[in-house]
């Protein structure tokens, strides 16, 4: 009996035309939502003039439906048993699941000012930037609508730069009508234990953002894992959002709509400093902001973002060192709301429910040559927003799963 089930599972989780896995893999049957909470800055003037702590108040959720588009350019390679694809990006605003509209205004850090002053550290260039910042009446903070902040706006300061630069700025710009990839993953035909594991991303086995093992593309994309998952496993996956591979460990047994699943969570150790977790040494890319690699809980992904000083963390700086959150008032981290988890059906390896949570922050530093940053006395890793991307298997799919998979085993 068990052997027959194993054989059936092995057959059905292969990523090729005609299998259950393939159908759900090409276009997810699960509704996936991305909720955003924006950190609205309450005291912009005091910060700019006196280098005060930044007081933030989160506003949200603002919800978008995402991952509703089928994978594109799906191409099987029989020679190396891989399948390659592009994952198109799309986001549709869901007013009924949101606290307001895309036209809601927020006071946030001026993304262009913070980024330009970081990218161009030469004093002369900063003096040029300063004159353009002043001319465009830009400041350290700005008021932007949700739509502008997420999907892009024409920046008045960058529009004055007299040589070719991208003048449109947005945390997720460009997004709609773009695609992530090309991913090339093992289809599992020759070896089911490799199914969905990424072979290459954008044609490479490495990212070129990090040193040593940190640069590797490990595991799957977290939508599924090879079948017959054990609680003792460490599940590796790659997330292009955070420009790195990461891992999850077993936390608890969960019953999801009558289906027994394993809850795997991202442990605090994954965000630890190299002092506590030596494996993380290669995620520490500079010595000043990281206080000689002793800070933890924030990841500098500037190399992956054309030099823009983007730092990724968990929401509200969960699992981050006190020095990171010290200059920010109004944060309340808690595990239940702010950690990432994956609920995996162990027989198939399918992720039936997940909550991916992350926070986007921007570094802003004092600059003697940029007037609006002149009075800062310290560096700030400024939270801009946090997001919660969730998906849960639908009732119909759950019934089908129970009858065809778990029911047959039990």
């Amino acid at each position: 009996g068990d052997l027959l089930i194993q054989k059936t599972i092995k057959k059905q989780v292969v990523l090729e035309e005609g299998t259950i896995a393939f159908k759900n893999w090409v276009k997810t049957g699960t509704e996936v939502y991305r909720q955003f909470w924006i950190f609205d800055v309450q005291n912009p003037q005091e910060v700019m003039m006196n280098s005060s702590n930044i007081q933030v108040k989160q506003r949200g959720p603002y919800t978008y439906r995402v991952r509703f588009l089928a994978k594109e350019n799906v191409t099987q390679d029989a020679e190396d048993n891989t399948v390659s694809f592009l994952q198109p990006n799309g986001a549709i605003f869901e007013p009924s699941l949101s606290v307001g509209t895309e036209a809601d205004n927020f006071t946030v850090l001026n993304l262009a000012v913070a980024a330009a002053s970081h990218i161009y550290q030469n004093q002369f260039v900063q003096m040029i930037l300063n004159s353009l910042i002043n001319k465009s009446k830009s400041s350290m903070f700005q008021v932007r609508t949700l739509r502008e902040l997420l999907w892009g706006y024409r920046d008045p300061f960058l529009s004055l730069v007299p040589y070719p630069v991208t003048t449109t700025v947005g945390l997720f710009y460009p997004y709609n009508n773009t695609a992530d990839g090309v991913y090339k993953v093992f289809n599992g035909k020759d070896n089911i234990s490799k199914v969905a594991i990424i072979d290459t991303y954008k044609g490479k086995r490495n990212l070129s953002y990090w040193e040593s093992h940190c640069d590797m593309i490990n595991g799957t994309d977290a939508a599924s894992f090879p079948p017959f998952v054990e609680k003792s496993q460490v599940l590796q996956f790659f997330s292009s959002d955070i420009c790195r591979s990461i891992y999850a460990v077993f936390e608890s047994d969960v019953n999801l709509k009558g289906i027994p699943v394993y809850r795997f969570v991202l442990p605090s150790k994954a965000f630890a400093s190299p002092v506590e977790n030596p494996d993380n040494y290669c995620f520490c890319t500079e010595k000043i902001i990281s206080k000689n690699c002793t800070s933890y809980g924030v990841l500098d992904i500037s190399k992956c973002k054309e030099g823009r000083p983007v730092y990724i963390s968990l929401p509200h700086f969960l699992y981050a060192s006190p020095d990171v959150s010290e200059p920010i008032d109004g944060l309340n981290p808690n595990e239940e709301e702010h950690r990432t988890y994956l609920d995996i059906e162990p027989i198939t390896g399918f992720t039936l429910q997940f909550a991916k949570r992350l926070q986007v922050n921007l570094l802003v530093k004092p600059s003697e040559k940029i007037q609006v940053l002149k009075n800062l006395k310290r560096n700030y890793i400024v939270p801009i927003l946090w997001l919660n991307e969730t998906g849960t298997i639908g009732d119909e799919k759950a019934n089908m799963f129970r009858s065809q998979v778990t029911g047959k085993i039990n």
């Epitope: 161009y120 004093q123 040029i128 004159s131």
Partner: antibody, heavy 118, light 107 residues
Framework: QVQLQQSGAELVRPGASVKLSCKAL????????MHWVKQTPVHGLEWIGG????????AYNQRFKGKATLTADKSSSTAYIEVSSLTSEDSAVYYC???????????WGQGTLVTVSV | DIKMTQSPSSMYASLGERVTITCKAS??????LSWFQQKPGKSPKTLIY???RLLDGVPSRFSGSGSGQDYSLTISSLEYEDMGIYYC?????????FGAGTKLELK
């Protein structure tokens, strides 16, 4: 040792233009900005402007906007200043000067004498 | 524009004497000030940057001080090769501006 080699003296007619060069040696040309300074007995030293070859950024003294144009050729590590619609007022010694990571105007070229005369 | 007023415009001093030249800015320039020496027919030579930092290779008898609007260059013990014209420059904001110069001659 960093060196700045400027082009030779120029005798030019009023109304014409002149393009002076400053070749940079022994450092990474795109890292630091090059400034141009005009010197006359009447006005002393005057900053014309500067260019950062790495970013393409330029800054000008308003007094010289429309009069002087700064460019840089990364392939030959050479900075240029073009002075147009020349009058006797433009007769001067023109210096290029390099700013390094530590000091502004740390190195100077030998200067180019421009004489505007009929 | 920031105006740099240098004084004296010229001075005579003896060898071994302590010499001080001053430069006053029309506004606070945050110590973004350099000092240059120029000899006849030669290009300027940078001595001091950031108000008080000595450029490599410059003799230690030269020193700079000051903050805000007021700055000075001091030669602790004058030597023959120190004769020439001394200029200050502010690079706090555009346009960068030079002082009119101080001509130092042997008494």
């Amino acid at each position: 040792q960093v060196q700045l080699q400027q082009s030779g003296a120029e005798l030019v007619r009023p109304g014409a233009s002149v393009k002076l060069s400053c070749k940079a040696l022994n450092y990474t040309f795109t890292d630091y900005e090059m400034h141009w300074v005009k010197q006359t007995p009447v006005h002393g030293l005057e900053w014309i402007g500067g260019i950062h070859p790495g970013s393409g950024g330029t800054a000008y003294n308003q007094r010289f906007k429309g009069k002087a144009t700064l460019t840089a050729d990364k392939s030959s590590s050479t900075a240029y200043i073009e002075v147009s619609s020349l009058t006797s007022e433009d007769s001067a010694v023109y210096y290029c000067s390099l700013t390094t990571a530590s000091a502004w105007f740390a190195y100077w070229g030998q200067g180019t004498l421009v004489t505007v005369s009929v | 524009d920031i105006k740099m007023t240098q004084s004296p415009s010229s001075m005579y001093a003896s060898l071994g004497e302590r010499v001080t030249i001053t430069c006053k800015a029309s506004q606070d320039i945050n110590s973004y000030l350099s000092w240059f020496q120029q000899k006849p027919g030669k290009s300027p030579k940078t001595l001091i940057y950031r108000a008080n930092r000595l450029l490599d290779g410059v003799p230690s008898r030269f020193s700079g001080s000051g903050s805000g609007q007021d700055y000075s260059l001091t030669i602790s013990s004058l030597e023959y090769e120190d004769m020439g014209i001394y200029y200050c420059l502010q690079y706090d904001e555009f346009p960068l501006t030079f002082g009119a110069g101080t001509k130092l001659e042997l008494k």
